[in-house]
């Protein structure tokens, strides 16, 4: 997290807003709930109380306007800029402007009035950008999806660094961002895409360029917003510049940033038995055209040329890959070798040879 | 209905530089991903660069830190910025939105020369 320049902050912990103007994009009363609904995300993590007032002069003054409004700071028009706040002080200290050439919305289409509206109110209490991609605070917008929103843990610091806790957090379950290098980190899936290696971890992945050292760190939701959160397993099949990404009995195919119509389509339609209910790791090989699906503690193997399941099969991990054990969290096969991650470990396993070669930690992927 | 022209065209010496645009008709363009692929003589058509409605990009592999894809939503066009050239860069280069099931350009061609 990151706070202002000379930490400005409210002296007090009593705060007034008012809703000066409306969009036209949704109801009064959806904007009312929308903008409530931000400040409870602060309020309940902090000793700060929010009152709404109906005229007059409030701390935050909420509006929208369309380019320039009256700020010297100009909007720009549809996307680009969709709202900015002044950090705490007398005046425009505290006030939050939003993008009236933006569709503001309850849902994920447009742009997400809720929140914006609690990134915007972060910033009216002091909160500057975060570095984290996985914060409210990072400055790329992107929707996380209908559950229930819960405040991650790197804002939570931030404000608590301002204003101290409250007391009594009625959502005390605050989202990580995953650390790389933790010696515990276990992989959820690892594909390869356009010649680059994603790393899938709760809601993120990191993106390892070939040529590079330090992993990115994004939201999945930021690269493909209609798939879940987090995915089980995922490969790519190179020649056909798609990606399938598993998520329990669902799956999808993608081409870059786009999903293919008709997904997702149910993970039986591949020929797997209906009391599977998710595929924990999945790798294929452009070589043969096969791709292996493990899921407990069987493996099948699935023919892409033909779209039909192998005969044979499922079979045991410990038969036909001794010593890995009976699970696979994550899988990727590169140069001859396959690389199974069970745990925080990953086991590094000859094709031709048939066997483990090496044994490492899970995060060795990352260069930990 | 989106339609996609490319413009750009040209002949480069090798470690020069090129832009093409893709001027977009269609007010869904800012809702759909904008990507540009390439297809060399007697090859298949291949990933170039890509950028999400969000403006995340990726790269192949061959020209990350050579190209830069960018776009602007307002105007309804697409860019790319093709420098340090390679021989191996010459091909007819597509405009894409919305992926291999979207939009396609009719193709520009750009010849590197050594």
């Known amino acids: 997290y990151n706070v202002f320049p000379r930490t400005l902050k409210w002296s007090k912990m009593n705060l007034t807003y008012r809703i000066v103007n409306y969009t036209p994009d949704m109801t009064h009363s959806e904007v009312e709930k929308a903008f409530k609904k931000a400040f409870k995300v602060w309020s309940d993590v902090t000793p700060l109380n929010f009152t709404r007032l109906h005229d007059g002069i409030a701390d935050i003054m909420i509006s929208f306007g369309i380019k320039e409004h009256g700020d010297f700071y100009p909007f720009d028009g549809p996307s680009g800029l969709l709202a900015h706040a002044f950090p705490p002080g007398p005046n425009y200290g505290g006030d939050a402007h939003f993008d009236d050439d933006e569709t503001w919305t309850s849902s994920s289409k447009g742009y997400n009035l809720f929140l914006v509206a609690a990134h915007e109110f972060g910033h009216s209490l002091g909160l500057d950008h975060s570095k984290d991609p996985g914060a409210l605070m990072f400055p790329i917008y992107t929707y996380t999806g209908k559950s229930h929103f819960m405040l991650p843990d790197d804002d939570v610091q931030g404000i608590q660094s301002l204003y101290g806790p409250g007391d009594e957090d009625p959502n005390p379950k605050h989202p990580k961002t995953p650390d790389k290098c933790d010696p515990s980190l276990s992989l959820d899936a690892i594909t390869s895409l356009r010649g680059e290696t994603m790393i899938f971890k709760d809601r993120f992945f990191w993106r390892l360029h070939p040529q590079q050292v330090d992993a990115e760190l994004f939201l999945t939701k930021s690269f493909w917003p209609e798939l879940p959160n987090r995915i089980d397993a995922a490969y790519e099949h190179p020649s056909h510049d798609l990606i399938f990404i598993f998520r329990g009995r669902k799956f999808w195919a993608l081409n870059g940033y786009d999903i293919l119509e008709g997904y997702p389509k149910k993970i039986s339609e591949l020929g797997l038995p209906k009391e599977v209910k998710k595929i924990s790791a999945a790798v294929h090989f452009e070589d043969t055209g096969k791709t292996l699906l493990f899921s407990g503690n069987q493996v099948w193997r699935y023919d892409d040329t033909n779209h039909i399941m192998d005969k044979d099969y499922p079979r045991l991990i410990e038969e036909d890959f001794p010593g890995i054990g009976d699970k696979v969290d994550a899988v990727y096969e590169k140069n001859g070798y396959i690389y199974f991650f069970n745990g925080p470990i990953q086991f590094e396993y000859s094709i031709w040879s048939n066997r483990i070669v090496r044994v490492m930690p899970a995060n060795s992927i990352l260069w930990c | 209905e989106v339609q996609l022209v490319e413009s750009g065209r040209g002949s480069v010496q090798a470690g020069g530089s090129l832009r093409l645009s893709c001027a977009a008709s269609?007010?869904?363009?800012?809702?759909?991903?904008m990507n540009w692929y390439r297809q060399a003589p007697g090859k298949q058509r291949e990933f170039v660069a890509g950028?999400?409605?969000?403006?995340?990009?990726n790269y192949a592999v061959s020209v990350k830190g050579r190209f830069t894809i960018s776009r602007d939503n307002a105007e309804g066009t697409g860019y790319l910025q093709m420098n340090s050239l390679k021989p191996e860069d010459t091909a007819v280069y597509y405009c894409?939105?919305?992926?291999?099931?979207?939009?396609w350009g009719l193709g520009t061609q750009v010849t590197v020369s050594s």
């Open positions: 269609g007010s869904t363009f800012s809702r759909r991903s």
């Open positions: 894409n939105a919305g992926g291999l099931q979207g939009y």
């Open positions: 950028i999400s409605t969000g403006r995340i990009t």
